[in-house]
């Protein structure tokens, strides 16, 4: 008795996180038995949308012209092959940005911070929001995610770094999201460039230091220090 | 050249109805902006009426004052921003102004306004 | 609920003085506020935003100042063209709002 048949591979391209209205593809590899592929999108109808391999039949392309609202969510990606269908793909999270206007991102007390102080960033929305992103250029993934409990909505969410080291010099933008869906995030906000001087040794800091964790923020979220401001917002994807 | 040209507004009796349209030229409603009403009645001061996000899933909020009577739209494809007003009373009568708020928070372009006279 | 309330409703001054005008938040609004100037038959005209930057192409007489709940709109030397009325507004948008704009001070010279 053979077991299962190996999950396949999801991926998007040109990524994960799209603009509004832009095209993407969403690819699925599977085997060379592969004879259909199936492709479920969260709480909507299974199949979301079914293709036939291209040769050498190990993928299918799902092609999306132009994002929208509707195509924002969780997938998931299943094969056929003569002997049944494959496990499912490990989700593939797709995030629509521009379904909101930009939040703004400042530096407290300034973008020019002193290797060893503390710098708080500081986004904030003109409408109440439920969530806030922080993102870092060239990072792998978020650095924060601040979400409101209790559906209380916020206009504005602090980023507390300390102590601040040469890795969190950089550029950074954050976006807001609304309780319809995590999936539409906002526009981007304006880019705000993180200037850290000071010691020639610059030393990351230890866990033992602070809640920072020892590895910098390309390598692995940042956690912030003490506590959130407004009680209503909690951390997420720490 | 960047403007708002706000149109519709004229005499319509108490409990008509009536549509203002503000056209957006020089930049683009599905950037990101904010866009407000905001009404003024002869001799008083400004009134927020409501807002809508130029964002894809286009929020809008409105002053509690409103309560249902008016709804803001857009129709991106023309670059025009709606106020629907219903049920007209008297106290309605004002100029109705369009105002794009900036990224800095303030609102930074403003149309003429129309005016909207509800009376029998 | 978010209240702005300013003060004076009018004011008459001399041409020279300086003139003040206040605006009050019921609640902290950081520095999210805007002043303008309104002339009868025109719409209003940006001055300040973010509490304290000049608008562009904004005479120097003007200067704001405060953040959280107290503001303040400065005209340093009052000037005939500076007759009009003035109001300011808070930059949130949300639904539980009667206003964003405070009541207007209308500036008249004596």
């Known amino acids: 008795q053979a077991g299962p048949l190996p999950k396949p591979t999801l991926w998007a391209e040109p990524g994960s996180v799209i603009s509004w209205g832009n095209s993407v593809t969403i690819w699925c590899q599977g085997t060379l038995e592969a004879r259909e592929y199936r492709l479920d999108k969260e709480e909507s109808p299974a199949p979301w949308d079914r293709q036939n391999p291209l040769e050498p039949k190990n993928k299918a392309r799902f092609s999306i012209p132009s994002m929208t609202e509707d195509y924002a969510g969780r997938y998931r990606c299943y094969y056929r092959s003569p002997v049944g269908w494959s496990q499912p793909s490990d989700p593939l999270e797709l995030v629509m940005t521009g379904a909101y206007s930009k939040p703004t991102l400042s530096a407290l007390p300034s973008p020019l911070v002193t290797s060893g102080k503390s710098v708080t960033l500081l986004c904030q929305s003109r409408s109440p929001m439920d969530t806030f992103l922080l993102i870092k250029e060239r990072a792998a993934h978020p650095l924060l995610h601040l979400r409101s409990e209790h559906g209380a909505q916020q206009h504005q969410a602090e980023f507390p770094m300390s102590p601040v080291t040469s890795v969190h010099g950089g550029t950074y933008r954050c976006f807001s999201s609304h309780g319809f869906s995590h999936y539409l995030l906002s526009h981007p906000s304006d880019p705000l460039e993180l200037i850290v001087s000071g010691s020639l040794e610059d030393p990351r800091p230890s866990p033992t230091r602070s809640v920072s964790t020892a590895a910098g923020p390309e390598d692995q979220p940042l956690m912030p220090t003490g506590s959130v401001p407004h009680s209503g917002l909690r951390r997420h994807w720490e | 050249e960047v403007q708002l040209v706000e149109s519709g507004g004229g005499l319509v009796q108490p409990g008509g109805s009536l549509r203002l349209s503000c056209a957006a030229s020089?930049?683009?409603?599905?950037?990101?902006?904010?866009i407000s009403w905001v009404r003024q009645a002869p001799g008083k001061g400004l009134e927020w009426i409501g807002s809508i996000d130029s964002g894809s899933v286009g929020i809008t909020y409105y002053a509690t004052w409103v309560k249902g009577r008016f709804t803001i739209s857009r129709d991106n494809s023309k670059n025009t921003l709606y106020l629907q007003m219903n049920s007209l009373r008297a106290e309605d009568t004002a100029v109705y102004y369009c105002?794009?708020?900036?990224?800095?928070?303030?609102?930074?372009?403003w149309g003429q306004g129309t005016l909207v006279t509800v009376s029998s | 609920d978010l209240v702005m309330t300013q003060s004076p409703s009018t004011l008459s001054a001399s041409v020279g003085d300086r003139v003040t005008i206040t605006c009050q938040a019921s609640?902290?609004?950081?520095?999210?506020l805007a002043w303008y100037q309104q002339k009868p038959g025109k719409p209003p005209k940006l001055l300040i935003y973010k509490a304290s930057t000049l608008a562009s192409g904004v005479s120097s007489r003007f200067s704001g100042s405060g953040s959280g709940t107290e503001f303040t709109l400065t005209i340093s030397s009052l000037q005939p063209d500076d007759v009009a009325t003035y109001y300011c507004?808070?930059?949130?948008?949300?639904?539980?709002?009667?206003?964003?704009f405070g009541g207007g001070t209308k500036v008249e010279i004596k």
């Open positions: 609640q902290s609004i950081n520095s999210w």
């Open positions: 105002a794009r708020h900036g990224d800095n928070w303030a609102l930074d372009l």
């Open positions: 020089g930049f683009s409603l599905s950037s990101s902006y904010w």
């Open positions: 507004q808070h930059g949130y948008i949300r639904g539980d709002l009667d206003n964003v």
